[in-house]
């Protein structure tokens, strides 16, 4: 969480953003909230990036004001029109891109004062696992699979009941580049593998965390995913 | 100096609709939210509706969906609220009131009253 | 819909002492709550936004506190004027639910 405050003394008004991430290829959110303020007219949202000479979006007198807007960010960008009213200057990014990385500026006017906060915007590929019991396999096995990682995540098995254990012995992971030629298949395998246990597929790269969980026992298969963003930092 | 001027009280048949006006002046019109807000005899105060002029859009309170309707007309700085399929329970001072977020200035009030 | 409530639902204080007035919502509302006055037969009027920020004309015994779910308004020497309901309100989402209130009467 960035708090950020207006230089001009008494004229400040405090802008909050929270460091996030993108998903490549998805729409992405940068989150920014203001101190509202009554007088809609006055409030000027201003999105910048570091190293970027346009600006990424800008919205004032209610409407979106794209002029100056850089190109890299032509027809991507929105705010949250009717949101602004309370306080929230957050931009939508559509089809968030690896280039969409580096550190963005919330710059707010008010009929209050001025105010602004950094924010770290980090982008990849992340997906959730999904991990099944591999019947062709000659023994008992797991196969985890996730269809999009990026930058190449690390795997890792455990398990409930071997707490601790360490499976690198008794696991294979692949990376398989798909079509667009920069995110990746995960695909792990665990072998010997013992029913009345629940094994765990722990996915990981400095963007997310991802885990699949299955509970193999004579009568069922139970499953369960689970994905956290990594730094998500408010400013 | 602001003044949210409001149409007068009204009595009106369960069943029918009412239409409220709010005359705005003393400031630009379109650069602030309208909001409806209501009382009932000895009740609290209830939210129901905010347009935003210069955005052009409205909420509404998920009680009153379906039966609100607000709007504004920029060339006369005038608010208006209708509220249809009155019930008895809809008998109340009707406010206009400049904002969200928050509201600094109000209208002086029309009183509806919805009887057989 | 976040839920507003105030405590107590009237209050007995005499002129000249301190009232604390209580508002809680159901989740955090961050900063964004506001305080109204409203007497008998009139509209309701605007005390404080922002939790603190007093609102033009308003006199400086009117103080609010607070942050995320519980806040209070404190008026710390009560005068005549002073009696009558008192609202508070979140605008941290639409939307923008009002408290249930406070009586302030004359002990």
């Known amino acids: 969480l960035i708090i950020g405050f207006g230089i001009s003394g008494r004229h400040s008004i405090t802008v909050t953003t929270v460091a996030s991430a993108g998903n490549i290829g998805e729409d992405g959110i940068l989150s920014c909230t203001f101190e509202p303020d009554i007088k809609l007219s006055d409030i000027v949202i201003q999105w910048l990036k570091e190293g970027v000479i346009g600006l990424v979006h800008e919205f004032k007198e209610g409407k979106d004001e794209l002029s100056e807007q850089d190109e890299m960010f032509r027809g991507r960008t929105a705010v949250f029109a009717d949101q602004v009213i309370v306080g929230n200057a957050s931009l939508r990014l559509k089809n968030v891109q690896l280039t969409d990385a580096g550190t963005y500026k919330c710059y707010i006017i008010t009929s209050k004062g001025k105010g602004n906060a950094n924010l770290e915007y980090k982008t990849g590929a992340f997906s959730m696992p999904e991990v099944n019991v591999d019947y062709n396999a000659s023994s008992e096995t797991l196969r985890c699979e996730a269809p999009r990682w990026f930058p190449q995540p690390t795997v890792v098995w455990a398990s409930q009941v071997d707490q601790g254990a360490n499976f690198s012995e008794v696991s294979n992971t692949s990376f398989e580049l798909n079509s667009e030629n920069v995110t990746m298949k995960v695909v792990s395998v665990l072998y010997n593998v013992t029913i009345n246990n629940t094994y765990s597929c722990m996915i990981e790269n400095d963007i997310a965390k991802a885990t699949g969980d299955i509970k193999v026992t004579e009568s069922e298969i139970k499953r369960r995913s689970h994905l956290q963003l990594l730094n998500s930092k408010a400013s | 100096q602001v003044q949210l001027v409001q149409s007068g009280a009204e009595v009106k048949k369960p069943g029918s609709s009412m239409k409220v006006s709010c005359k705005a002046s003393g400031d630009t019109f379109s650069s602030y939210a309208i909001s409806w807000v209501r009382q009932a005899p000895g009740q609290g105060l209830e939210w129901m509706a905010g347009i935003i002029p210069v955005f052009g859009t409205a909420h509404n309170a998920q009680k009153f969906q379906g039966r609100v309707t607000i709007t504004a007309d920029k060339s006369t700085s005038t608010a208006y609220m209708e509220l249809s399929s009155l019930r008895s329970e809809d008998t109340a001072v009707y406010y206009c009131t400049r904002g969200g977020p928050y509201f600094d200035y109000w209208g002086q009030g029309t009183l509806v009253t919805v009887s057989s | 819909e976040i839920v507003m409530t105030q405590s107590p639902a009237t209050l007995s204080v005499s002129p000249g002492e301190r009232a604390a007035l209580s508002c809680r919502a159901s989740?955090?509302?961050?900063?964004?709550l506001a305080w109204y006055q409203q007497k008998p037969g009139q509209a309701p009027r605007l005390l404080i936004y922002g939790v603190s920020t007093r609102a033009t004309g308003i006199p400086d015994r009117f103080n609010g506190s607070g942050s995320g779910t519980e806040f209070t308004l404190t008026i710390s020497s009560l005068q005549s004027e002073d009696f009558g309901a008192y609202y508070c309100q979140q605008y941290k989402k639409w939307p923008f639910i009002f408290g249930p209130g406070t009586k302030l009467e004359i002990k």
């Open positions: 989740q955090s509302v961050s900063s964004n």
